[in-house]
């Protein structure tokens, strides 16, 4: 058993049929010595008396808010949460496996630039009685500071019969140099509590590996005389690290119809303009990627051909 | 020491081209190592990230773009700062800083070259003959060093009398390649920045 926060404790349980469970001793936070009784949640049934209560925690029915009273007055609370371990593996029931970039990916993180600011998000099908708390650091043995905000519900989607909820959090490394060469990864730890179930999820990464630039901005087309070709130009996104001659991007320019199966024109360039063949009912799209370290491509920025 | 002329010519000497070749060569070599040594811990997640140039060179600091010198976090470990008379920079100071930057890059290359050659000598003794360093990568290191045009004491190639532990050597190769790739990215950024200046 360990303390998650004041008056909230996590009991770690091996979860299998007829498991013996964990013996837990609760102590009432009071100078009083006698006349103390214990109850669980909203029940008035007295579970025991005395300054300490010893319980055998085996299942969710044994978890919850234990309260010690004296003469109708509440003295203190202890909330017990369960953390299940099945076949030596901690449960991951609360969050959905996003399976990208690999299986067992519960947290996904992205950074728009090298400033040390990043966003992580996760998915769940649970809509109520759910809380998250996020901590982060650079390295684990001698951690350096990363400050994370509160996790917020950022999107709701309908997937078949189920509703899916996306939560996200923004974090900022306290003293980040965009040009630094990372040797220690960023660690992100998310504590998830659903009713009386506790789970924790972690992710470890280098900022350079989670870079995903914003799409290029100000796409403009200039038809070329006596030709089917158009010159398309664009600018670096505002959120990208500066100077751009140091933090350079490379671009992919594509002309395609509405369907992905349609034919296309595609060209890669390090410049902020390119010449492509425009077709009726097609769109010109441009996306960006770090020129020197191949992490993710940005989303597409698009303009219609006509 | 013979410092290069520190005003970038229109093509930033041939260094930009060579640095691009360097990044390509080390990326290819790292990819090859990951594939060939698939049963060794050779991915970014599995290895310890060590920098053999730590405390010996200061490439990131010496080559910091002017625009980032206002960022306190970037100046932590700088012995020499760009900043003179507020944020103004005298051209002589620029020349000096650029020479310092390029000589730091040269020292990095020299250190990695020695390490890679020593390692290759060990790998050539491996009866499994599983992996060797790409001669192209070694050649590209050499070409960039020549383009940088510094003279410095030659570092003797380390020789070891004991029987090499090939497993450890291959893991060290992965560590070196990962670190060298990150440094090659920095070098490429620097050359691109200098070329545009």
């Amino acid at each position: 058993i360990w303390e998650l926060k004041k008056d909230v404790y996590v009991v770690e349980l091996d979860w299998y049929p007829d498991a013996p469970g964990e013996m837990v001793v609760l102590t009432c936070d009071t100078p009083e010595e006698d006349g103390i009784t214990w109850t669980l949640d909203q029940s008035s049934e007295v579970l025991g008396s005395g300054k300490t209560l010893t319980i055998q925690v085996k299942e969710f029915g044994d978890a919850g808010q234990y309260t010690c009273h004296k003469g109708g007055e509440v003295l203190s609370h202890s909330l017990l949460l369960l953390h299940k371990k099945e076949d030596g593996i901690w449960s991951t029931d609360i969050l959905k496996d996003q399976k990208e970039p690999k299986n067992k990916t519960f947290l996904r993180c992205e950074a728009k630039n090298y400033s040390g600011r990043f966003t992580c998000w996760w998915l769940t099908t649970i809509s109520t009685d759910l809380t998250f708390s996020v901590k982060s650091s650079r390295g684990s043995s001698d951690p350096q500071g990363v400050t994370c905000g509160a996790a917020t519900l950022s999107a709701e989607r309908v997937r078949g019969d189920n509703k899916e909820y996306e939560y996200s959090v923004e974090c900022q490394e306290d003293s980040a140099c965009p040009a630094a060469e990372e040797s220690l990864p960023i660690e992100v730890m998310v504590d998830a509590v659903h009713k009386l179930k506790y789970e924790n999820y972690t992710s470890s990464f280098f900022i350079r590996d989670i870079i995903k630039p914003d799409p290029p901005k100000n796409l403009q087309l200039k038809p070329l005389k006596n030709s089917r070709q158009v010159e398309v130009s664009w600018e670096y996104p505002d959120t990208w690290s500066t100077p751009h001659s140091y933090f350079s991007l490379t671009f992919c320019v594509q002309v395609q119809g509405k369907s992905k199966r349609e034919k296309k024109d595609r060209v890669f360039t390090d410049k902020t303009s390119a010449t492509v063949i425009c077709r009726k009912n097609a769109s010109i799209s441009v996306r960006a990627q770090d020129r020197y370290y191949s992490s993710s491509w940005s989303e597409w920025a698009s303009v219609p051909c006509s | 020491r013979n410092l290069p002329v520190a005003t970038p010519d229109p093509g930033m000497f041939p260094c930009l081209h060579h640095s691009q070749n360097l990044l390509r060569a080390v990326s290819n070599m790292l990819q090859k190592a990951r594939q060939t040594l698939e049963f060794y811990p050779c991915t970014s997640e599995e290895i310890d990230h060590e920098d053999i140039t730590k405390d010996k060179t200061s490439t990131v600091e010496a080559c910091l773009p002017l625009e980032l010198t206002k960022n306190e976090s970037c100046l932590n470990s700088r012995e020499t700062s760009f900043i003179t008379n507020g944020s103004c920079l005298a051209s002589r100071k620029t020349s000096f800083m650029m020479a310092l930057c390029l000589s730091s890059i040269y020292e990095d290359l020299k250190m990695y070259q020695v390490e890679f050659k020593t390692m290759n000598a060990k790998l050539l003794m491996d009866p499994k003959r599983q992996i060797f360093l790409d001669q192209n990568m070694l050649a590209v290191i050499d070409e960039l060093m020549q383009a940088l045009n510094f003279n410095s004491e030659t570092v003797p190639q380390k020789s070891s009398l004991e029987e090499p532990d090939f497993y450890k050597t291959k893991i060290k190769l992965c560590i070196l390649l990962h670190a060298f790739r990150i440094r090659a990215v920095t070098i490429d950024r620097v050359m691109s920045y200098l070329n545009a200046s």
Epitope: R228, T250, K263, V267, F268, T269, D270, T275, I277, R279 | -
Partner: antibody, heavy 118, light 107 residues
Framework: EVQLVQSGAEVKKPGATVKISCKAS????????LHWVRQAPEKGLEWMGW????????EYAPKFQGRVTITADTSTDTGYLELSSLRSEDTAVYYC???????????WGQGTLVTVSS | DIQMTQSPSSVSASVGDRVTITCRAS??????LHWYQQKPGKAPKLLIK???QSISGVPSRFSGSGSGTDFSLTINSLQPEDFATYYC?????????FGGGTKVEIK
Amino acid sequence: EVQLVQSGAEVKKPGATVKISCKASGYTFSDYYLHWVRQAPEKGLEWMGWIDPENGDTEYAPKFQGRVTITADTSTDTGYLELSSLRSEDTAVYYCAANKELRYFDVWGQGTLVTVSS
Amino acid sequence: DIQMTQSPSSVSASVGDRVTITCRASQSISINLHWYQQKPGKAPKLLIKFASQSISGVPSRFSGSGSGTDFSLTINSLQPEDFATYYCQQSNSFPLTFGGGTKVEIK
């Protein structure tokens, strides 16, 4: 299976015009760009131009501009290359090639040998 | 027009050898470079697109790299069926242009 089948060999006199065909099968003809590339004996490859069968848009290499015409007939899924004012240097194997992407060649015809000789 | 220069023009190698062919563009073409294999009397066959992207059905011993002006095609362990002529082609701008070819011959 995506396939391009070209017409047979041709022998032409200098100054004449040749028209060779390229019949597509195994895909929707207008879904792919169609190119023509030639190869002189013991020489390299030379791109001549492309057509978008969907709308008839064409682009030619400047070297052949004014002498070459590329057409496509969507009713028969066939592309054509017409080269006029033939000279001996035009002796080559002419290939049609197709792709959903405009700028490289995924599927090739078997080639048509055109010999220009007096 | 963008000129593409391949080297060497021919190379003699044995089965099992590692062969590298290079292609240089007269100006920077990013990764807009494709490789083809051609056997005598046959049409060319696409091997690699956009400098390093593999093509389904092409053996993994063929790999490409490069960007800007310098590119290479590597055949990792040469097989008897790999003796052929190899061409690079730029798609950065029209007109599309090919390298002069590299003939891989049996030593």
